[in-house]
């Protein structure tokens, strides 16, 4: 019963981290403009893996498509890689793990074939997550080291022409997102290879059975009967490190249509 | 068609508050955000303050912090902005104006002008 | 605050003849974000209020006749009447459009010579 619940858990939360990379991937807010020295502003600049937007007072917001593919910077092409790989794998993760579920019966599928789903879709999870968090921190990394630059050189010269005011961006909510998202698939995948032990079939070995003739009298001698669970070695007292997701304190809102920041 | 319809002129004492009506027609009062322009005689415009008739939110120019208060009445369609402790150069023509929403945050639609006029 | 210049403060120009505004801006108005200008121009008439003639720093309001223009980017702006009408006396005003709180320039008063 503790493994099905695991198991059924497992999946759960890597269905929810996984909905959470996919909601994270498509976001716009992966970037916003620093509101630190204004916190009101007449023009709102924020930025995601796929376009750029701007939102005026008047609430009305213009998204930009990077249209272009060689001009983009590596590490925003790698960052993309990772969230797809994150994603992918997570779909055929949960793909192979509903199939892995003890409380579906599809067949006559054998309870070893079932554990070593359970196992490659928890993998999956887990690798998933991973990607998710490490293309999160890819891009967190990218902005740290974008805003103190800007800081330090706040105004940049367009053309040697036009003095500008370099806009500088902080952490947009789609970071919080992925993060959460992608310890959410780690943890559901840690839990779905916890499920696959409970879920390896009882080894049922018979000694052999050796009967001896003296005279008339037959001697039967039964042998000891041992199971055990688990694949290979005895797997008691062994215990489960899992870190939990950390996620900042702080809540970004971002306003409707009507609002104006 | 469009139109913001502001109230009478008014002569106010110094120290005095004066409270202006902009009724709005013509458009979607809510999708718009409301703005208040002052005008000196012979002088330029000078922007005091915005307020979102959708949620009601406000953001004033900091000159007037503490002394105007622009708020909205969503079931006349019309915005009030009332400034308070008027000082002798607080005379001048104050008009409403609305906010273009894809017009680069321009003002397209403007009310006639209220002349409030401070004085002992 | 962002503070905004006009030159001149008044103009004669005879009728049929191209009339010339300046505004500059003591800090950029161009937005990285969308690539645009956050620069609007007004005409105000005696005893009216302003009429938006540019926003964007170039794109003309609907109704706006084509002799108006607008251009410049960053914090050089120019307004053009290509072929100056009676109808076109006026003072005309730049808006900072980018930046709270926004600013006007202080005016450039165009007559007939």
């Known amino acids: 019963m503790a493994v099905t619940a695991c198991q059924g858990l497992g999946f759960v939360v890597s269905l929810i981290g996984i909905a959470g990379i996919i909601a994270a991937t498509c976001m716009d807010q992966w970037s916003t403009q620093d509101l630190y020295n204004n916190p009101v502003t007449a023009v709102f600049n924020y930025q995601g893996l796929w376009r750029s937007c701007v939102r005026e007072s008047s609430g009305f917001t213009e998204c930009r498509g990077y249209f272009t593919l060689l001009g983009l910077p590596a590490m925003l092409q790698a960052v993309r890689a990772l969230m797809i790989v994150g994603i992918v794998l997570g779909a055929i993760g949960l793909l192979v793990s509903i199939f892995a579920l003890k409380c579906i019966r599809i067949g006559s599928m054998e309870d070893s074939a079932k554990a070593n789903m359970t196992l490659t879709s928890g993998i999956m999870f887990i690798v998933s997550g991973l990607c998710a968090i490490a293309g999160v921190s890819v891009f967190a990394n990218m902005l740290v080291t974008n805003f103190w630059m800007s800081t330090a050189n706040m105004y940049t010269g367009m053309g040697g022409m036009v003095q500008t005011v370099q806009t500088r961006y902080t952490f947009g909510a789609a970071l919080f997102v992925g993060w959460v998202a992608g310890g959410l698939t780690l943890i559901g995948g840690v839990m779905m290879c916890i499920a696959c032990r409970g879920l390896a079939p009882e080894e049922t070995n018979y000694k052999a059975v050796s009967y001896h003739a003296s005279g008339h009298s037959v001697a039967y001698k039964p042998g000891g009967f041992k199971a055990s669970t688990g694949f290979g070695s005895n797997t008691k007292n062994k215990k489960i490190y899992d870190g939990g997701a950390r996620t900042e304190d702080e809540v970004q809102s971002y306003p409707s249509k009507h609002d104006y920041v | 068609q469009v139109q913001l319809v502001q109230s009478g002129a008014e002569v106010k004492k110094p120290g005095a508050s004066v409270k202006v009506s902009c009724k709005t027609s013509?458009?979607?009062?809510?999708?718009?955000?409301m703005l208040w322009v002052r005008q000196a005689h012979g002088q330029s415009l000078e922007w005091m303050g915005n307020?979102?008739?959708?949620?009601?939110?406000?953001t004033y120019a900091l000159k007037f912090k503490g002394r105007v208060t622009m708020t909205v009445d969503r079931s006349t369609s019309t915005v009030y902005m009332e400034l308070s402790s008027l000082r002798s150069e607080d005379t001048a023509v104050y008009y409403c104006?609305?906010?273009?929403?894809?017009?680069?945050?321009?003002?397209?639609?403007w009310g006639q002008g209220t002349l409030v006029t401070v004085s002992s | 605050d962002i503070v905004m210049t006009q030159s001149p403060d008044s103009l004669a120009v005879s009728l049929g003849e191209r009339a010339t505004i300046n505004c500059k801006s003591s800090?950029?108005?161009?937005?990285?974000?969308?690539?645009?200008?956050?620069l609007a121009w007004y005409q105000q008439k005696p005893g009216q209020p302003p009429k938006l003639l540019i926003y964007?720093?170039?794109t003309r309001e609907s109704g706006v006749p084509d002799r108006f223009s607008g251009s410049g980017s960053g914090t050089d702006f120019t307004l053009t009447i290509s072929s100056l009408q009676a109808e076109d006396v006026a003072v005309y005003y730049c808006?900072?459009?980018?930046?709270?709180?926004?600013?006007f320039g202080q005016g450039t008063k165009v007559e007939i010579k």
């Open positions: 104006a609305r906010d273009g929403y894809s017009l680069r945050n321009a003002m397209d639609y």
């Open positions: 013509g458009y979607s009062f809510t999708d718009y955000l």
């Open positions: 307020i979102n008739p959708y949620y009601g939110r406000t």
């Open positions: 800090q950029s108005l161009f937005n990285s974000g969308n690539q645009k200008n956050y």
């Open positions: 964007g720093a170039s």
């Open positions: 808006q900072n459009a980018h930046s709270y709180p926004y600013t």
